[in-house]
């Protein structure tokens, strides 16, 4: 009778095992083992027992001990079961961002692992089991469907294999896949709201605001603002589920024309975009041209107003005839025209909006000097010892220098309060002088003596 020990073995793949073949007869003609595995005999004294080291066991095997005794030949098999954990435990790749409300299919693939009867595949969200199935097929595949919820955001999904060899006196061997971190998101169907000027003047700055509500997670939303090819750099303010992106936009002459203003919101693998057109225009203030800004009284003056070729101008409230970018008027300069403002207003229509620009120029008229009765009376009669202020105003542009002298030396204190004395009496020659010439006028001061009773 041939016996084998152990009769059943579970061992790791590539491992070794000692198998003892024994026979009940004392003098067997033959005692040995039949196996395709590499073997070594570990010698022992005696004839009825042999120990073999079987090595590099890669798969389940059934070595057979045999003995040839006087009463016949017999055999005994030992059952070697190889165990090994899977070589690959993998979740099928998925986009990391998933919209809330979508059905997500998790697929786990398991390659290798034995014995399959003891191998289970578990799909997990965090530590929560979603599905548990025995490993079947090569590769074994286990799938489950998850309805994506907002609170799944940041959850780790994984696949675990469990090779449970505890019933065989070994342990539970676990292999876990790389986790798949789910990022859930909500991007509303409504496009972002874009507030910006419809028209923008060259070399100026405008403010653009792009906003959107109902986003999750709002902090992960990417906002792209651009005017044509110019990427804007917005300051983004976040609310609970909204954002507002504010950017300054500067335009130059190169941008002139119709430009596309874009606000794109990217969240997860989706985006929403709003487009708007902005017209960039160049509209310098109209030019007011005076023949000469400073003229002498009586000179003919031409005032011209020139503006943008598409503008319509009015000069001092009078529209150009015909209506267009140019207007002019002619005048003969009078002293009353000194300091007169000539205002040109230009209007340009840009993308349905009327843009107004003004320019004003002042005319200086040189005249005088003048001394007339109204402003410089020729006769004053004042009581002696009274307080009086001699007044004499010379007119002209530039303002004349005025001096009133008696006998060429004694001055009349113009504009000063004086006590009237006899010395003040007499005839004064008032002379007003400027670059435009000089005029003179005689002024007589009479002093009335008090009556003594």
């Amino acid at each position: 009778q041939t016996s084998v020990s152990p009769s059943k073995v579970i061992l790791p793949r590539g491992g070794s095992v000692l198998v003892t073949c024994s026979t009940s007869c004392d003098q067997p003609k033959l005692l040995g083992i039949e196996t395709p595995l590499p073997k070594k005999e570990l010698l022992l004294p005696g004839n009825n027992r042999k120990v073999y080291e079987l090595s590099n066991v890669q798969e389940d095997s059934q070595p057979m001990c045999y003995s040839n005794c006087p009463d016949g030949q017999s055999t005994a098999k030992t059952f070697l079961t190889v165990y090994w954990t899977p070589e690959r435990v993998e979740l099928a790749p998925l986009p990391s961002w998933q919209p809330v409300g979508k059905n997500l299919t998790l697929r786990c693939q398991v390659e290798g692992g034995a014995p399959r009867a003891n191998l289970t595949v578990v799909l997990l969200r965090g530590e929560k089991e979603l599905k548990r199935e025995p490993a079947v097929g090569e590769p074994a595949e286990v799938t489950t469907t998850v309805l994506v919820r907002r609170d799944h955001h940041g959850a780790n999904f994984s696949c675990r294999t469990e090779l449970d060899l505890r019933p065989q006196g070994l342990e539970l061997f676990e292999n876990t896949s790389a986790p798949y971190q789910l990022q859930t998101f909500v991007l509303p169907a409504t496009p972002p709201q874009l507030v910006s000027p419809r028209v923008l003047e060259v070399d100026t700055q405008g403010t653009v605001v792009c906003s959107l509500d109902g986003l999750f997670p709002v902090s992960e939303a990417q906002v792209h603002l651009a005017l044509g090819d110019q990427r804007l750099n917005p300051t983004v303010t976040y609310g609970n589920d909204s954002f507002s992106a504010k950017a300054s936009v500067s335009v130059t002459a190169e941008d002139e024309g119709t430009q596309r203003l874009t606000c794109a919101v990217i969240l997860g693998n989706q985006s929403q975009e709003t487009l708007q057109t902005v017209t960039i225009y160049s509209f310098p203030a109209p030019n007011v041209i005076l023949t000469k800004p400073e003229v002498s009284e009586g000179t003919e003056v031409t005032v011209k107003c020139e503006a943008h070729p598409r503008a319509k101008v009015t000069l001092n409230g009078v529209p150009a005839q015909p209506l267009g970018p140019r207007a002019q008027l002619l005048l003969k300069a009078t002293p009353e025209d000194n300091g007169r403002s000539f205002s040109c207003s230009a209007t340009l229509e840009v993308a349905g909006q009327l843009i107004h620009k003004n320019q004003t120029r002042e005319l200086r008229v040189l005249y005088g000097p003048r001394l007339d009765e109204r402003d410089c009376p020729g006769n004053w009669t004042w009581p002696e010892n009274s307080q009086q202020t001699p007044m004499c105003q010379a007119w002209g542009n530039p303002l004349p220098e005025l001096k009133c002298l008696k006998d060429g030396t004694f001055p009349l204190p113009i504009g000063e309060s004086v006590t009237v004395t006899r010395d003040l009496e007499g005839t004064y020659l008032c002379r007003a002088r400027s670059t435009q010439g000089e005029v003179t006028r005689k002024v007589t001061v009479n002093v009335l003596s008090p009556r003594y009773e």
């Epitope: 000692l18 070594k40 005999e41 570990l42 010698l43 022992l44 004294p45 080291e53």
Partner: antibody, heavy 116, light 107 residues
Framework: EVQLVESGGGLVQPGGSLRLSCAAS????????IHWVRQAPGKGLEWVAR????????IYADSVKGRFTISADDSKNTAYLQMNSLRAEDTAVYYC?????????WGQGTLVTVSS | DIQMTQSPSSLSASVGDRVTITCRAS??????LHWYQQKPGKAPKLLIY???QSISGVPSRFSGSGSGTDFTLTISSLQPEDFATYYC?????????FGQGTKVEIK
């Protein structure tokens, strides 16, 4: 009948070399493992080296690594222990023994004395 | 390396006595422990393999037990030819190591 016979021992100066032989009979050395175990005078047993004659895989004790070489010639059914750079502490009876994990059969031993 | 410690180092006993020798490993070695008997001027002789497995031709009074780190060799009734030195040896991991020996002497 399984038999192991060692030879090659003797007196050698420190730094010298010796080659021990172990002739096996009653079994084929390729079917098992051959070890050398030594015993210093009045001391215990110390495992030295092992060879798998089927593939010449070898393992050594740290105390002899780099100085001793175990080898086998299966055509002669003989194993060898080449000992170089011998030291006084290598003085011992060297036994050739067989089996894998335990030592079931032993030779009579050969004495190696390292002394100047 | 795994250290093997035998106790006692020596003992005196009379014929017919029950003798117990223990061997302790510095770490668990499962049942990979073997016992040898050595008489002066002779090669060691295998008595027990794998802690408790008997050897053909070895008297049944020799038995072994233990697993993990603690092992015992028992001679149920000491005979005159049993006076010798006994060694334990582990084969759990390289290098294989022996205990320092237990000398059994006649009382």
């Amino acid at each position: 009948e399984v038999q192991l016979v060692e030879s090659g021992g003797g007196l050698v100066q420190p730094g010298g070399s010796l080659r021990l032989s172990c002739a096996a009979s009653g079994f084929n050395i390729k079917d098992t493992y051959i070890h050398w175990v030594r015993q210093a005078p009045g001391k215990g047993l110390e495992w030295v080296a092992r060879i798998d004659p089927a593939n010449d895989n070898t393992i050594y004790a740290d105390s002899v690594k780099g100085r001793f070489t175990i080898s086998a010639d299966d055509s002669k059914n003989t194993a060898y222990l080449q000992m170089n750079s011998l030291r006084a502490e290598d003085t011992a009876v060297y036994y050739c023994t067989t089996s894998g994990y335990w030592f079931a059969y032993w030779g009579q031993g050969t004495l190696v004395t390292v002394s100047s | 390396d795994i250290q093997m410690t035998q106790s006692p180092s020596s003992l005196s006993a009379s014929v017919g006595d029950r003798v117990t020798i223990t061997c302790r490993a510095s770490q668990s070695i499962s049942n990979n422990l073997h016992w040898y008997q050595q008489k002066p001027g002779k090669a060691p002789k295998l008595l027990i393999y794998h802690a408790s497995q008997s050897i053909s031709g070895v008297p049944s009074r020799f038995s072994g037990s233990g697993s993990g780190t603690d092992f015992t060799l028992t001679i149920s009734s000491l005979q005159p030819e049993d006076f010798a030195t006994y060694y334990c040896q582990q084969s759990n991991s390289w290098p294989y190591t022996f205990g320092q020996g237990t000398k059994v002497e006649i009382k």
